[in-house]
């Protein structure tokens, strides 16, 4: 099994352009796939959690924020490798000893299942079929998100899986 | 200026070593994977090696595979690559590159000079 | 490992020449190729990614196409600067892998 790169990879400086471009559309910047409202970008190379955390920040967006079963789903059916694991914005706060999102919201209970230890430097991730904890130092890919916004003469293609 | 800027090279003979260095400047050293590429003399570029930002994964091509070693130095914004068992056949320039994106393996915009490493004896 | 064939490995054109370089992979990349351009005695140049997006500073006359195993570079009208050597490279799965090169030469 040769190790995937990745699904999606992102450029967002703002001074590349497609060979053959289009007019104004409300899409997602090159490599970020459109996922219902929302552009995901699955990283092709690996960080540990803070610099996976750090690196979507770099790009005007936040690591995956999950809000129900259904965008679980949505989410992991975008993996197409067993294999491949990636970061998403929730980690084990100590203080508050639960997991909360990056945003500052609090897992519930019926949200997520998470299988693994809920401890100090445990962060998640997703796979194709399961939610795991892991240290926080692991290095794994990751997945960014961002508010689909009016992108000028940047389109996507059709597909990037 | 944004810049890679190799060293190292030179002449070695058949099982001897070389460690070879990249030193950046004009960007954030530390969020990027860097990849080593080799070109022999007058022939195709060959991905060598590549490791993660963080420092903590790498991968290699099968031909150098238990013979050299890739890491890095994101304090002092250096990658190396340590060349053991050194054969004829990696007689070569090298170069470090950087890629497009830091969420990217490959698509290098920034490449360095190279440094030719030559095996004879 | 993917494999990247290139043809042709050499053609000779002519200033203000169209000049059209495949390259298919021996598997499904998707849109992850990039082409490079190198001149004798220098590094690699990118010129294109993910297929079809141009490089930053890359003139218009380049452009890029293709998806799943066949990909185009092709150069609108051959400027005296464009001869040189190109590479495409995939960046789908590890190892990453280059063609091997097709050198643009003076008719």
């Known amino acids: 099994q040769k190790p995937s790169i990745g699904k999606c990879s992102v450029d967002i400086q703002q001074n590349r352009t497609k060979t053959t471009e289009r007019p104004d559309l409300l899409n997602c910047p090159i490599y970020w796939q459109q996922v219902q409202e929302k552009c995901l970008l699955f990283s092709h190379t690996v960080n540990p959690w803070n610099n996976s955390l750090a690196d979507c920040s770099t790009k005007e967006s936040s690591l995956l924020l999950i809000q129900d079963k259904d965008e679980l789903t949505r989410t992991q059916n975008l993996i197409h490798d067993k294999a491949i694991s990636f970061w998403i914005g929730l980690n084990f706060s100590l203080s508050e000893k639960n997991w909360k999102w990056i945003n500052g919201s609090f897992l519930s209970s019926n949200d997520l299942k998470i299988t693994g230890d809920a401890k100090e430097n445990s962060c998640v991730y997703i796979s194709q079929t399961s939610v795991y904890s892991e240290y926080c130092s692991t290095e794994m890919k990751w997945i960014c998100q961002k508010e689909l916004t009016l992108v000028r003469n940047k389109v996507s293609p059709d597909s990037w899986l | 200026e944004v810049q890679l800027l190799e060293s190292g090279g030179g002449l070695v003979q058949p099982g001897g070593s070389l460690r070879l260095s990249c030193a950046a400047s004009?960007?954030?050293?530390?969020?990027?994977?860097m990849s080593w590429v080799r070109q022999a003399p007058g022939k195709g570029l060959e991905w060598v090696s590549a490791i993660s930002a963080a420092g903590g994964t790498t991968y290699y091509a099968d031909s150098v595979k238990g013979r050299f070693t890739i890491s890095r130095d994101n304090s002092k914004n250096t990658l190396y690559l340590q060349m053991n068992s050194l054969r004829a056949e990696d007689t070569a320039v090298y170069y470090c590159?950087?890629?497009?994106?830091?969420?990217?393996?490959?698509?290098?915009?920034?490449w360095g000079r190279g440094t030719l490493v030559t095996v004879s004896s | 490992d993917i494999q990247l064939t290139q043809s042709p490995s050499s053609v000779s054109a002519s200033v203000g020449d169209r000049v059209t370089i495949t390259c298919r992979a021996s598997q499904g990349i998707s849109s992850w190729l990039a082409w490079y351009q190198q001149k004798p005695g220098k590094a690699p140049k990118l010129l294109i990614y993910?297929?079809?997006f141009l490089q930053s500073g890359v003139p218009s006359r380049f452009s890029g196409s293709g998806s799943g195993t066949d990909f185009t570079l092709t150069i609108s009208s051959l400027q005296p600067e464009d001869f040189a050597t190109y590479y495409c490279q995939q960046a789908s799965v590890l190892p990453i892998t280059f063609g091997g090169g097709t050198k643009v030469e003076i008719k």
């Open positions: 993910a297929a079809s």
């Open positions: 590159a950087k890629p497009l994106d830091s969420s990217q393996w490959a698509d290098f915009d920034l």
């Open positions: 004009g960007f954030t050293f530390g969020q990027y994977a």
